[in-house]
Interface confidence: medium
């Protein structure tokens, strides 16, 4: 029993929440609490909500030596004193293009034609007053309606005969009926023009520019055109520079340089020729060999200009 360690009131400290323990007697202590706490061991968080200043229906939420206000949706700020401008919220408080007017503790909406309700979310049924021709179907839209016409009828109210029935548009053109007068309108595919899309568009004669690049020759065709390319170019509009090096024309580990309409071979020492296919004469040696190799490199444009011929198919 004698081995029991003596009781020390403040070791360990019974004070919680940051309270400081002070021994007041052999077996007694006192806790000095941090602001916001009370009790013999500082165990209680003092309710800071009495005399709170939350306004406009804000609810006081106690904290440690402070409090916060939980505001209703129409109010904000530390004490719910700042009006929420619902008109600045995203998405807009007024739907469907309605004009929002902020008010203290609320908002109002002025709706555009076709919408109603507090937030302009209700679409007014325009079909209730519509005059679609009997046999057609009315579809309600925003501040308007549209009539879905039966086969053979056209126009805003389906009161006109459909001019597209006779297939007046050619070359696969799209046919529409003018909703005002019932006449057909052809939307021509590329390469054709005219009321019925029967006229060919001469792309080569268009004012803006030649459709063929790199001086290619434009040839008009029915509904289209094609380009005849200069040597060294390919593609529908001669837009591609042919890489003559793709066919590996240079021999003996030479380096191939692509040129417009041709190529150049940079020979390794000891070789020459358009394709570096010839061996340099072995008779010269030493410095002469080096000089010859340099001469070949310097004058490669003169000696080794090679061409691959490109054939055009029309």
């Amino acid at each position: 029993a004698g081995s029991d360690s003596p009781y020390v009131p403040c070791a360990p400290s019974p004070c919680v929440n940051g309270g400081t323990c002070r021994q007041t007697g052999d077996f007694t202590f006192e806790c000095n609490c941090l602001p916001g706490f009370e009790g013999s061991t500082c165990e209680r968080n003092i309710d800071d909500c009495p005399n709170h200043r939350c306004q406009n229906g804000g609810v006081c939420v106690d904290g440690v030596n402070t409090y916060n206000c939980r505001c209703p949706p129409q109010w904000t700020g530390q004490f719910c004193t700042e009006d929420v401008d619902e008109c600045l919220l995203q998405p807009n408080a007024c739907q469907n293009g309605g004009t929002c007017t902020n008010r203290n503790g609320g908002y109002g909406c002025v709706c555009v034609n076709g919408w109603s309700g507090d937030d302009c979310s209700e679409n007014i049924d325009d079909c209730a007053y519509a005059s679609c021709t009997p046999g057609s179907t009315c579809i309600d839209r925003v501040a308007s309606f549209s009539c879905l016409c039966p086969e053979g009828k056209a126009g805003l109210l389906c009161h006109l005969d459909d001019a597209c029935i006779s297939n007046p548009c050619h070359k696969g053109a799209l046919c529409d009926t003018n909703p005002l007068n019932g006449q057909y309108i052809c939307t021509c595919p590329q390469g054709y023009k005219g009321a019925d899309c029967t006229e060919d568009v001469d792309e080569c004669a268009m004012a803006n520019s030649n459709p063929c690049e790199h001086a290619g020759k434009c040839v008009n065709t029915d509904g289209a055109f094609h380009c005849e390319c200069l040597k060294g170019y390919a593609g529908p509009r001669c837009e591609m520079d042919i890489n003559e090096c793709h066919s590996d024309p240079c021999q003996n580990d030479a380096t191939c340089l692509d040129k417009i309409g041709g190529f150049t071979c940079l020979c390794m020492p000891g070789f020459k020729g358009v394709h570096c296919e010839l061996e340099v004469n072995e008779g010269n040696s030493g410095l002469n060999d080096i000089f010859e190799a340099q001469k070949i490199e310097w004058h490669e444009n003169l000696y080794f200009q090679g061409h691959h011929h490109h054939h055009h198919h029309h």
Partner: antibody
Framework: QSVEESGGRLVTPGTPLTLTCTVS????????MSWVRQAPGKGLEWIGI??????TLFYASWAKGRFTISKTSTTVDLKITSPTTEDTATYFC??????????????WGPGTLVTVSS | AQVLTQTASSVSAAVGGTVTINCQAS???????LAWYQQKPGQPPKLLMY???TLESGVSSRFKGSGSGTQFTLTISGVQCDDAATYYC?????????????FGGGTKVEIK
């Protein structure tokens, strides 16, 4: 951080007087400000408070209608609407010691003397 | 209106002695938000204690506050000449039921 009162002077009864408390080193949007007065040889008397954030005003029951408190971003004013000789006192401006809680006052100005006499 | 009563308007103490000043509230002080101030002639009040028992920073630990509800006490131990002053209690009350703040009438401490 400091507060300082100004505007105290000799006035005749019934002449409105406005005292100004100028603060520096802290924001009036966070701390409550109270006006307290002390008649010569008497005790401290709380007049009223303007609360931070909400800007709510509270006055002592005896002070209602006799005083008006208002504030700007750096000053707090006390208007004595119709002074009487009983309003002769040193007027103190005091800052609340805890943000958004009335509690106690841990920063006081030196005071400004108002004398009301005909 | 809420009232704080300091029973003794003045007390006398010897240097090194102990002074006890009582403050009684007419109704419960909000969360024991009761403060004590020291005021010397020609000066503004100086905060000593708040929350009934929390010592303000820089104030001597010879000052001790206690109490709760409506009864509060300020104790000055090892009284010094510099402690000669008038001491005021001040409490916070529910604003909804009257005055938010009230001061006691003051207790003047004289040193023998």
């Amino acid at each position: 951080q400091s507060v300082e009162e100004s505007g105290g002077r000799l006035v005749t009864p019934g002449t409105p007087l406005t005292l100004t408390c100028t603060v520096s080193g802290f924001s009036l949007s966070s701390y409550d400000m109270s006006w307290v007065r002390q008649a010569p040889g008497k005790g401290l008397e709380w007049i009223g408070i303007i609360q931070a954030g909400s800007n709510t005003l509270f006055y002592a029951s005896w002070a209602k209608g006799r005083f008006t408190i208002s504030k700007t971003s750096t000053t707090v004013d006390l208007k004595i609407t119709s002074p009487t000789t009983e309003d002769t006192a040193t007027y103190f401006c005091a800052r609340g010691g805890v943000i958004f809680i009335i509690g106690h006052f841990n920063l006081w100005g030196p005071g400004t003397l108002v004398t009301v006499s005909s | 209106a809420q009232v704080l009563t300091q029973t003794a308007s003045s007390v006398s103490a010897a240097v090194g002695g102990t002074v006890t000043i009582n403050c009684q509230a007419s109704q419960s002080v909000v969360n024991n938000r009761l403060a004590w101030y020291q005021q010397k002639p020609g000066q503004p009040p100086k905060l000593l204690m708040y929350g009934a028992s929390t010592l303000e920073s820089g104030v001597s630990s010879r000052f001790k506050g206690s109490g709760s509800g409506t009864q509060f006490t300020l104790t000055i131990s090892g009284v010094q000449c510099d402690d000669a002053a008038t001491y005021y209690c001040q409490g916070e009350f529910l604003c909804s039921s009257g005055d938010c703040v009230a001061f006691g009438g003051g207790t003047k401490v004289e040193i023998k």
